[in-house]
C-alpha cells in the first residue's frame, strides 16, 4: 500500500513509471550476478547486497547516477538497463548524465562545469513530472503523469527551493531532488545532516522526499545514537570518512 512505502532517498530517484510504462512494472527486479563490480563515480560498487534499479532513461535515476546497460559482463542482465553510479571528473563518458553533478561530458571526458557549455536558449526534450492532475489524485494514484515537452531552457541557475528537472538546472551546491509535489533545487548535504542510505532491497518505493548526496569528504552512515530505533526508522547522517 502507498502508506507503507519508502519515500525518501539519497539516490534521488524518480517515481516509477505507470504500469506498462517504459520502465516496466514498478519494483521489477533485475537479476545481477552477486559480486559484480560496477565502476562508480567515487568507488567500485559490489552488488552482493545491492539490487539495481531498473531504468529506461537517465531521468529515472538519481542525480548521482545515470541509466545504462552494465558493461562489465554481469550475467543474467541481458538488455536491461540499470542505474549506475555517476563518473567523476576525468573519467570517460558518452553524455552529460554520466558525469557526476558539477561536471559535464566534453570530448568523452567528465569535466568540471563552468555552465558556459550550455547554449543560451537551448531547446531540450525534458521530462516534466506532475504528481496527479489539476486536482488531488485519488488515493493510490501516486504515479506521475509523464509528458515530454520541448521547452526553452535559459539556464539561469535555480536557487534553493525553485523547480528543476535535473541537477544541472540548479546553482552550485544544489541538486535537483523530489520534494513531495515537485522536484526542486536542494542543498548538497553537510556534516550531521540527515541523509538516506538507499538499499534497493525488494520492491522500490515511491520516493517523494529525496535528499542530495553528502558533500565532499562525507559519507552517509547510520547515526550512532540511533541504534535503539527500529531498523525501518533509523536515521543516517552525513559523517566524515
Amino acid at each position: 500500500t502507498l502508506n507503507s512505502v519508502l519515500i525518501n532517498s539519497n539516490a534521488i530517484k524518480n517515481l516509477p513509471p505507470p504500469l506498462g510504462g517504459a520502465g516496466g512494472q514498478p519494483g521489477s527486479a533485475v537479476s545481477v550476478a552477486p559480486g559484480v563490480l560496477y565502476e562508480g563515480g567515487n568507488k567500485y560498487q559490489t552488488l552482493d547486497n545491492y539490487q539495481p534499479y531498473p531504468c529506461a532513461e537517465d531521468e529515472e535515476c538519481g542525480s548521482d547516477e545515470y541509466c545504462s546497460s552494465p558493461s562489465r559482463g554481469a550475467a543474467g542482465v541481458g538488455g536491461v538497463q540499470i542505474c549506475l553510479a555517476c563518473r567523476k571528473r576525468r573519467k570517460r563518458c558518452m553524455r552529460h548524465a554520466m558525469c557526476c553533478p558539477g561536471n559535464y561530458c566534453k570530448n568523452g571526458i567528465c569535466m568540471p562545469s563552468d555552465h558556459s557549455h550550455f547554449p543560451r536558449g537551448e531547446i531540450e526534450e525534458s521530462i516534466i513530472e506532475n504528481l496527479g492532475n489539476d486536482h488531488n489524485a485519488a488515493a493510490g494514484d501516486g504515479y506521475p503523469r509523464r509528458t515530454t515537452l520541448t521547452s526553452k531552457i535559459y539556464h539561469t541557475k535555480g536557487q534553493e527551493g525553485s523547480v528543476c528537472l535535473r541537477s544541472s538546472d540548479c546553482a552550485a551546491g544544489l541538486c535537483c531532488a523530489r520534494h513531495f509535489w515537485s522536484k526542486i533545487c536542494k542543498p548538497v548535504l553537510k556534516e550531521g545532516q540527515v541523509c538516506t542510505k538507499h538499499k534497493r532491497k525488494g520492491s522500490h518505493g515511491l520516493e517523494i522526499f529525496q535528499r542530495c548526496y553528502c558533500g565532499e569528504g562525507l559519507a552517509c552512515r547510520i547515526q550512532k545514537d540511533h541504534h535503539q530505533a527500529s531498523n525501518s526508522s533509523r536515521l543516517h547522517t552525513c559523517q566524515r570518512h
Epitope: 502508506n3 534553493e160 527551493g161 515537485s182 538516506t196
Partner: antibody, heavy 116, light 112 residues
Amino acid sequence: QVQLVESGGGLVQPGGSLRLSCAASGFTFSSYWMSWVRQAPGKGLEWVSVISSDSSSTYYADSVKGRFTISRDNSKNTLYLQMNSLRAEDTAVYYCARHGIDFDHWGQGTLVTVSS
Amino acid sequence: DIALTQPASVSGSPGQSITISCTGTSSDLGGYNYVSWYQQHPGKAPKLMIYDVNNRPSGVSNRFSGSKSGNTASLTISGLQAEDEADYYCQTYDQIKLSAVFGGGTKLTVLG
C-alpha cells in the same frame, strides 16, 4: 528580499464568495510552487492549497475541495485564492506561503470573516 | 488521516534547554523521516526554523536543532531566551491525500 503581501480579506456572509490575492516580490515567482495556509482565531495552522510553478498542478485540503480554487498569474507575480460557498468555519487569517523547501517564506496574512 | 500530536504547552527558564515533541505513526514520521518546524509569534506570520528533520535555513540560530527517533520528531531549543516565547508547529506531508499537514502547535513560555 522575499516579500509576500496578501489582500482581499474581509467580512462575507455564509454562502458568499471572496477572492484573495498575494503579491510576490524579491524572487523569481515563476520558479516556485505557492501555497495558501490558514489559521482560525486561536487555533493552529491548516494547509489549504498549493499550485505548481506553471499552474499545471493544484492540490487542495479536503475541507475546501470543490469550493476553493487556487490560481496564479506569473506575469503579474500574483497568487490568487477564489473562495466560494463560504462557511463560518472558513473564518481565519489566510497566509500566502512560498513552497520552496517547505513553506520557507510567508506573508503577514489577511483576515477572512464569514458571518451573518 | 495523518495526525501529528504535539504537547499543548512547554515552559522553561532563560538559559535552559527545552524539547518539543511531535508524534506521528510508523506510516508517516516513522516511515519516511521527514518533518519541519515553524515558529510563530503572536500576531505574526510563521517562520520556518527547521526542515528535513535537522536542517536550519540560513538566518536561524544554531540554538534551534531538530532530531527524530522512531515515530517522534523533536525540536530542541538550547540557551532559552525571552524572544523564543512563541507557538511552534511541526509539519509533514500526507502521501495519500497529497497534502501538507501541521501538528496542533505547542505554546512555549519562557519563565521569569
